[in-house]
């Protein structure tokens, strides 16, 4: 799996999970989240050569097409596969509320 | 939806469905599929600005992050959403067989 266990331990130009810390105020302009101040969102990036963690038959076809036709703009892209939620604290006036924001943290990647 | 009905009628730089015909022999080097000789595979391509057909909360966060930090390499990518199968004719020796290959045709796209 193209997850932290593999990607953070290997220098990998191909599609892999990359570390990314997001500060809510600085990076997103969000002032409404009180806790946490930021989080490890991570992201997916890297090349998708033939058979590198292809998601579907179409992405396999596309990466093979791209190998044979390298000048073409059609190629698979490295995107998130498994995502996890993030629990946040925010306020309604003076009343604290806890909410779980779904699909906030990328845990693994795929070529799609 | 970023499908043929929308994307093939509009000139769109942002993430959208693009037409792509694949000839099995010429483009993939596949001789084993006897019919069809090729098919309209299509592909997804284009920019993913903030809120342009974002797939998850993470892709919305990432596109907003990318707007505020344009020099960053972290940004969502335009990938396939709905896919359809393709029915093919192949041979076992001299015996013809029909098979449905799943996820071969892209019908719509998303920013993920």
């Amino acid at each position: 799996a193209l997850d932290a266990a593999y990607c953070f331990r290997n220098v990998q130009d191909n599609c892999c999970l990359r570390p990314l810390y997001i500060d809510f105020k600085r990076d997103l302009g969000w002032k409404w989240i009180h806790e946490p101040k930021g989080y490890n969102a991570n992201f997916c990036a890297g090349a998708c050569p033939y058979l590198w963690s292809s998601d579907t038959q179409h992405s396999r076809v596309l990466s093979l097409y791209n190998t044979i036709n390298p000048e073409a703009s059609a190629s698979p892209c490295c995107v998130s596969q498994d995502l996890e939620p993030l629990t946040i604290l925010y306020y309604i006036g003076k009343t604290p509320k806890i909410e779980q924001l779904s699909n906030m943290i990328v845990k693994s990647c795929k070529c799609s | 939806a970023l499908d043929a009905a929308y994307c093939f009628r509009n000139v769109q730089d942002n993430c959208c469905l693009r037409p792509l015909y694949i000839d099995f022999k010429r483009d993939l080097g596949w001789k084993w599929i006897h019919e069809p000789k090729g098919y309209n595979a299509n592909f997804c391509a284009g920019a993913c600005p903030y809120l342009w057909s974002s797939d998850t909360q993470h892709s919305r966060v990432l596109s907003l992050y990318n707007t505020i930090n344009p020099e960053a390499s972290a940004s969502p990518c335009c990938v396939s959403q709905d896919l359809e199968p393709l029915t093919i004719l192949y041979y076992i020796g001299k015996t013809p067989k029909i098979e449905q290959l799943s996820n071969m045709i892209v019908k719509s796209c998303k920013c993920s």
């Epitope: 058979l51 | 001789k31 192949y90 041979y91 076992i92 001299k94 067989k97």
Partner: nanobody, 126 residues
Framework: EVQLVESGGGEVRPGGSLRLSCVVS????????IGWFRQAPGQEREGLGC????????WSADSVKGRFTISRDNVRNTVYLQMNALKPEDRGVYYC???????????????????WGQGTQVTVSS
């Protein structure tokens, strides 16, 4: 890198048996088609049979049906040609050929295979 290596050829009496092996490397797991061919002196290469590695579907030419059987062992990445009731006309160089792109099926035509083994000699004489 795709490679096919045959072994198991030799000399046998009419009515005898041989099992040829073709070790396949460089193929995607369980995918691809393997064909067996033979070439007798001064003759065209003849398709004997083939197998789809994924689902194990096989085909045998009429000339060897009931005598020759093709099987696969995907763990060992090996395809076998079991030859029984051998006849003098079965002599020749036996080749295995591979098409790693095949998701399904296998061909009886030599032109559809990109990769070939070095061949193994089979002699049938009393």
């Amino acid at each position: 890198e795709v490679q096919l290596v045959e072994s198991g050829g030799g000399e046998v009496r009419p009515g005898g048996s041989l099992r040829l092996s073709c070790v396949v490397s460089g193929f995607t797991k369980d995918y691809g088609a393997i064909g067996w061919f033979r070439q007798a002196p001064g003759q065209e290469r003849e398709g004997l049979g083939c197998i789809a590695r994924k689902d194990g579907d096989t085909w045998s030419a009429d000339s060897v049906k009931g005598r020759f059987t093709i099987s696969r062992d995907n763990v060992r990445n090996t395809v076998y040609l079991q030859m029984n009731a051998l006849k003098p006309e079965d002599r020749g160089v036996y080749y295995c050929a591979g098409d790693p792109s095949a998701l399904y099926g296998c061909s009886d035509r030599s032109s559809e295979y990109q990769y070939w083994g070095q061949g193994t000699q089979v002699t049938v004489s009393s």
